[in-house]
Interface confidence: low
């Protein structure tokens, strides 16, 4: 179950998704992708507290354990619930092609 | 793609399916689980370093962003890939009832 | 603006019934747990039960006489078989963040329930 | 069930005081405890979430702490906007002990 997004450490400390901005050099991607020559990805970054945003049993489980064992089991993580697409134009043997990625940008986060 | 499972830092190091013995009191479910007294909890613990079992794309994105900005974009994460049903014995007001939760066992491990 | 407004309170005969509701905006019902919660005049607080993604829980005592729904805006109680003891004034409340914790993060104005023959 | 019992059920204090209010729950609840505030007419207004988590926007006079059955929400110096009912909530299981809330404490001026 999806939880809600109030963050308890303070606006904007919890799991969310956040816009960074890469050229295709930061992303290695200089020498295989013609356009866009700069991404905005979508990436879903903070701290994962009690509960918050629990991906599902597992993810309470771990919050149970992380509290009682913190040096044995890590705190849920914040990671991607769901992508959105992106096509990126890149270069091929005999020009360019459009190829569309499912799994490249962050939609939703929740912590796992 | 999923990727190698080479752990550069050594053996065991790296993102894999670990076991953590836990209780019902540790889970604060000894209220409304009956059986099984005692859970082998399998979890995903471990470091992601470059490419180690990434995910897909967006976790190679984030392994070069988090190279170029550490502070800002945290390293990939282990989190499951799968996961093994388990089966409780619940509590309930006229009873007992077998409940399967599909999403409490990690069954396999990638950094995402 | 987060804000929840609750409506459908008033004067109801013992033995009768009402629904109430609470129109949330500026969030989306489908991320959220709802609550109510009721006070009566000059007592404490109340907790009567919970709509979640799966569905709902009550309060031992609310349970039968109390039913909790949602669409897509709205949380609704509805109340039968109306006693005097259930003259308050009724709340609906956002959960902060669900597992296994469920403080109530926002709250409605509340709306004012008498039951009197 | 899980009963709450707060006290004092009210006290009398002037502003700067350091007040504590109690609250102790019939069996063990871990942290999972949220302390609310209301004044007359209107709806609670959350201070407190797991006992000690300070909710957005209150300030840090006010703290909370406790877990297992006994916790405390401390006003470190009374303010005049602090006279008030006060009430702690378990948060823990809804699903086979629900949420009660304790009975309140009302923090009247001396």
């Known amino acids: 179950a999806r939880n809600g997004d109030h963050c308890p450490l303070g606006p904007g400390r919890c799991c969310r998704l956040h816009t960074v901005r890469a050229s295709l050099e930061d992303l290695g991607w200089a020498d295989w992708v013609l356009s866009p020559r700069e991404v905005q990805v979508t990436m879903c970054i903070g701290a994962c507290p009690s509960q918050f945003r629990a991906a599902n049993m597992h993810a309470q489980i771990k919050t149970s354990l992380h509290r009682l064992k913190p040096d044995t089991v890590p705190a849920p993580c914040c990671v991607p619930a769901s992508y959105n697409p992106m096509v990126l134009i890149q270069k091929t043997d005999t020009g360019v092609s459009l190829q569309t990625y499912d799994d490249l940008l962050a939609k939703d986060c929740h912590c796992i | 793609a999923r990727n190698g499972d080479h752990c550069p830092l050594g053996p065991g190091r790296c993102c894999r399916l670990h076991t953590v013995r836990a209780s019902l009191e540790d889970l604060g479910w000894a209220d409304w689980v009956l059986s099984p007294r005692e859970v082998q909890v399998t979890m995903c613990i471990g470091a992601c370093p470059s490419q180690f079992r990434a995910a897909n794309m967006h976790a190679q994105i984030k392994t070069s962003l988090h190279r170029l900005k550490p502070d800002t974009v945290p390293a990939p994460c282990c989190v499951p890939a799968s996961y093994n049903p388990m089966v409780l014995i619940q509590k309930t007001d006229t009873g007992v009832s077998l409940q399967t939760y599909d999403d409490l066992l990690a069954k396999d491990c990638h950094c995402i | 603006e987060v804000q929840l407004v609750e409506s459908g309170g008033g004067l109801v005969k013992p033995g009768g019934s009402l629904r109430l509701s609470c129109a949330a905006s500026g969030f989306s019902l489908s991320n959220y747990y709802m609550s109510w919660v009721r006070q009566a005049p000059g007592k404490g607080l109340e907790w009567i039960g919970m709509?979640?993604?799966?569905g709902t829980t009550y309060a031992t005592w609310a349970k039968g006489r109390f039913t909790i729904s949602k669409d897509s805006s709205t949380v609704y109680l509805q109340i039968n078989s109306l006693k005097t003891e259930d003259t308050a004034v009724y709340f609906c409340a956002r959960v902060v963040y669900a597992g296994w914790t469920y403080p109530l993060g926002i709250w409605g104005q509340g709306t004012l329930v008498t039951v009197s023959s | 069930d899980i009963q709450m019992t707060q006290s004092p059920s009210s006290l009398s204090a002037s502003v700067g005081d350091r007040v504590t209010i109690t609250c102790q729950a019939s069996?063990?609840?871990?942290?999972?405890l949220s302390w609310y505030q209301q004044k007359p007419g209107k709806p609670p207004k959350a201070l407190i979430y797991?006992?000690?988590i300070l909710a957005s926007g209150v300030p840090s006079r006010f703290s909370g702490s406790g877990s297992g059955t006994d916790f405390t929400l401390t006003i470190s110096s009374l303010q005049p906007e602090d006279f008030a009912t006060y009430y702690c909530?378990?948060?823990?299981?809804?699903?086979?002990?629900?949420?009660?809330f304790g009975g309140g404490t009302k923090v009247e001026i001396k």
């Open positions: 069996q063990s609840i871990s942290s999972v």
């Open positions: 709509i979640s993604f799966s």
């Open positions: 909530q378990a948060n823990y299981d809804v699903y086979n002990y629900g949420n009660p």
């Open positions: 797991e006992a000690s």
